[in-house]
């Protein structure tokens, strides 16, 4: 099966790599603009230069292109706790991230929020906090994991999943009491 190509991909595939087909004359292949620039005017004829202009402040192109306009720079979402890792340049978009000891939770493909890494109090770090994943904790005896925090088994209600994890502790306590009464 031949993959479906859009009109632009079809047009570009006629020309060698790094060139695109002139929109008004399909016998002419124009050189694409370098990253950091955009297409101001198509090349007038074969072997003649494409008129490319540098992106203005606040915009960029990250790869060779024949875009009529540069792309607007992204803004880091302060309300999501994001901070700017590197500012936008003519050839690279803004890079946003999280502060130290935070991880990214992606709400959707292009939207993330920064959350503090779990400290694993009353437990140990099983897997360290990473850029896109919270710390994975293992709890000490007498504690169970709830919402990635180690909670005392005294807070374990019968209906919760923690009964399985806290049961040995409860049995041990009963066993000690029984041996003490003989």
């Amino acid at each position: 099966l031949v993959p479906h190509l859009g009109d632009r991909e079809k047009r570009d595939s006629v020309c060698p790599q790094g060139k695109y087909i002139h929109p008004q004359n399909n016998s002419i292949c124009c050189t694409k603009c370098h990253k950091g620039t955009y297409l101001y005017n198509d090349c007038p004829g074969p072997g003649q230069d494409t008129d490319c202009r540098e992106c203005e402040s606040g915009s960029f192109t990250a790869s060779e292109n024949h875009l009529r306009h540069c792309l607007s720079c992204s803004k880091c979402r302060k309300e999501m706790g994001q901070v700017e890792i590197s500012s936008c340049t003519v050839d690279r978009d803004t890079v946003c991230g999280c502060r130290k000891n935070q991880y990214r939770h992606y709400w959707s493909e292009n939207l993330f929020q920064c959350f503090n890494c779990s400290l694993c109090l009353n437990g140990t770090v099983h897997l360290s906090c990473q850029e896109k994943q919270n710390t994975v904790c293992t709890c000490h005896a007498g504690f169970f994991l709830r919402e990635n925090e180690c909670v005392s088994c005294s807070n374990c209600k019968k209906s919760l999943e923690c009964t399985k994890l806290c049961l040995p502790q409860i049995e041990n306590v009963k066993g000690t009491e029984d041996s003490g009464t003989t």
């Epitope: 939770h105 709400w107 959707s108 292009n110 959350f115 919402e147």
Partner: nanobody, 120 residues
Framework: EVQLLESGGGLVQPGGSLRLSCAAS????????MGWVRQAPGKGLEWVSM????????YYADSVKGRFTISRDNSKNTLYLQMNSLRAEDTAVYYC?????????????WGQGTLVTVSS
Amino acid sequence: EVQLLESGGGLVQPGGSLRLSCAASGFTFTRYSMGWVRQAPGKGLEWVSMIDTRGVRTYYADSVKGRFTISRDNSKNTLYLQMNSLRAEDTAVYYCAKISQFGSNAFDYWGQGTLVTVSS
């Protein structure tokens, strides 16, 4: 077919409270983060709050932090928004939304909305 049905809106005095509900059907509710979005008269859409699949991680717009609480009951396929200390500027149509896992849009399905009017 994905369906999101909001309820609980109405007229309330400033300082009052309301609890919005959203009954979800037509998709596996437990697999998706959910959210509330609002549109005030003559204004654009504003994200209000979001909650992850297990109800652990939440997001609140600065304008509602400390006053609104989002929650979900996965056993009932229902999303909630508890709104306290309501202000006139909270007047809007509130939409329940399913958060998209892919693509550039955060939300891929919306409900019909429920009107919240804060007025004395």
